[in-house]
Interface confidence: medium
């Protein structure tokens, strides 16, 4: 009998009430793998959530957040308020990044500017609330008579903290 159920494909369930016939999942339900004895209820994207992908008989719906909010958690389980670039979200709302820190996204926290001197480089472009500093050649490389054959190092990609 188990073998009969294992023949039921995704999008169906093994119906014990009907001699283990493979029955299609009812509306608003799905089975993503074969051999299922029940179909799972589709997720409903309501309230702060909007539908990114409709539920089908073989896959669950996928939700996104409404405008002004972004997803947090596995499978967009929560929506969090956006801020502008150059800000971070605190309990009291969106606050500007402190001097020496930046945020180039609408989410996440303000992060410290790159310390160019740690890599023996100098600041080529100053940082802002929205952008990291751009590091250039080391001060020694810029001294008179120094070889200019070596191109300046590319700006370091700022590390992104986990969201």
């Amino acid at each position: 009998l188990q073998d009969l159920c294992s023949n039921c494909p995704a999008g169906t369930f093994c119906d014990n009430n009907r001699s283990q016939i493979c029955s299609p999942c009812p509306p608003n339900s799905f089975s993503s793998a074969g051999g299922q004895r029940t179909c799972d209820i589709c997720r409903q994207c309501k309230g702060v959530f909007k539908t990114r992908k409709e539920c089908s008989s073989t896959s669950n719906a996928e939700c996104d957040c409404i405008s002004g909010y972004h997803c947090l958690g596995a499978e967009c389980s929560m929506c969090e308020q956006d801020c502008k670039q150059g800000q971070e979200l605190t309990k009291k709302g969106c606050k500007d990044c402190c001097f020496g820190t930046f945020n180039d996204q609408k989410r996440g926290i303000c992060r410290p500017w790159t310390n160019c001197s740690l890599d023996g480089k100098s600041v080529l472009v100053n940082g802002t609330k929205e952008r990291d500093v751009v590091c250039g050649p080391s001060p020694a490389d810029l001294s008179p008579g120094a070889s200019s054959a070596t191109p300046p190092a590319p700006a370091r990609e700022p590390g992104h903290s986990p969201q």
Epitope: S77, M78, K92, G93
Partner: antibody
């Protein structure tokens, strides 16, 4: 579906304290941000404070600092708001409200409790 | 704190009328604006959140629009059960603040 049921009406003397309860059903209290809003007779709505479960932080309105305490009994899925040093102008309907499941700092309020009338009179 | 100003403070209308209530914020609040309906002796009920999103179960005759500082709640065809007081509320920053309310009365 979240439902909030508040404790009954209270009459208090000036200088006393009042503690209003808000029982959550349909979800556990730890899943919800809890907010308290009051409405004085014939007046508008005034936010008093919020509790955020992600890190257990509570924020109070400046106006009530030092007089308000919001607490939670998670085992009973009940939130409490205590207001001390009551004066006549604290006579109001006090509401608890959540901001909807899945919302972090959305700060819109739904659903609301039915309200608790607190009368401060000598 | 961000100040919210509603207009008018009250209005008289008839069943079937199109009603518009406006709300102005003292600074830009993007789309973080919510609308509530309150009937006497009852708790407020959320109608619209994030300026234009209709709360589940709220009739489609209610709609919200606006961004920045100016927002509008529109009832396309006023029904008997819509006579109530309406409040706007900003959720851009703490403290969340409410407008003073607009009472919609029967003409």
């Amino acid at each position: 579906e979240v439902q909030l049921v508040q404790s009954g009406a209270e009459v208090k003397k000036p200088g006393a304290s009042v503690k209003v309860s808000c029982k959550v059903s349909g979800y556990t209290l730890t899943e919800l941000s809890m907010h308290w809003v009051r409405q004085s007779p014939g007046k508008g709505l005034e936010w008093m404070g919020s509790f955020y479960p992600e890190d257990g932080e509570t924020i109070y309105a400046q106006k009530f600092q030092g007089r308000i305490t919001m607490t939670e009994d998670t085992s009973a899925d009940t939130a409490y708001m205590e207001l001390s040093s009551l004066r006549s102008e604290d006579t109001a309907v006090y509401y608890c409200a959540t901001e909807g499941v899945g919302v972090i700092r959305g700060n819109w309020f739904d659903p609301w409790g039915q309200g608790t009338l607190v009368t401060v009179s000598s | 704190d961000i100040q919210m100003t509603q207009s008018p403070s009250s209005l008289s209308a008839s069943v079937g009328d199109r009603v518009t209530i406006t709300c102005r914020a003292s600074q830009s609040i993007s789309s973080y604006l919510n609308w509530y309906q309150q009937k006497p002796g009852k708790a407020p009920k959320l109608l619209i959140y994030a300026a234009s999103s209709l709360q589940s179960g709220v009739p489609s005759r209610f709609s919200g629009s606006g961004s920045g500082t100016d927002f509008t709640l529109t009832i396309s065809s006023l029904q008997p059960e819509d006579f109530a007081t309406y409040y706007c509320q900003q959720s851009y920053s703490t403290p969340p603040t409410f407008g003073q309310g607009t009472k919609v009365e029967i003409k």
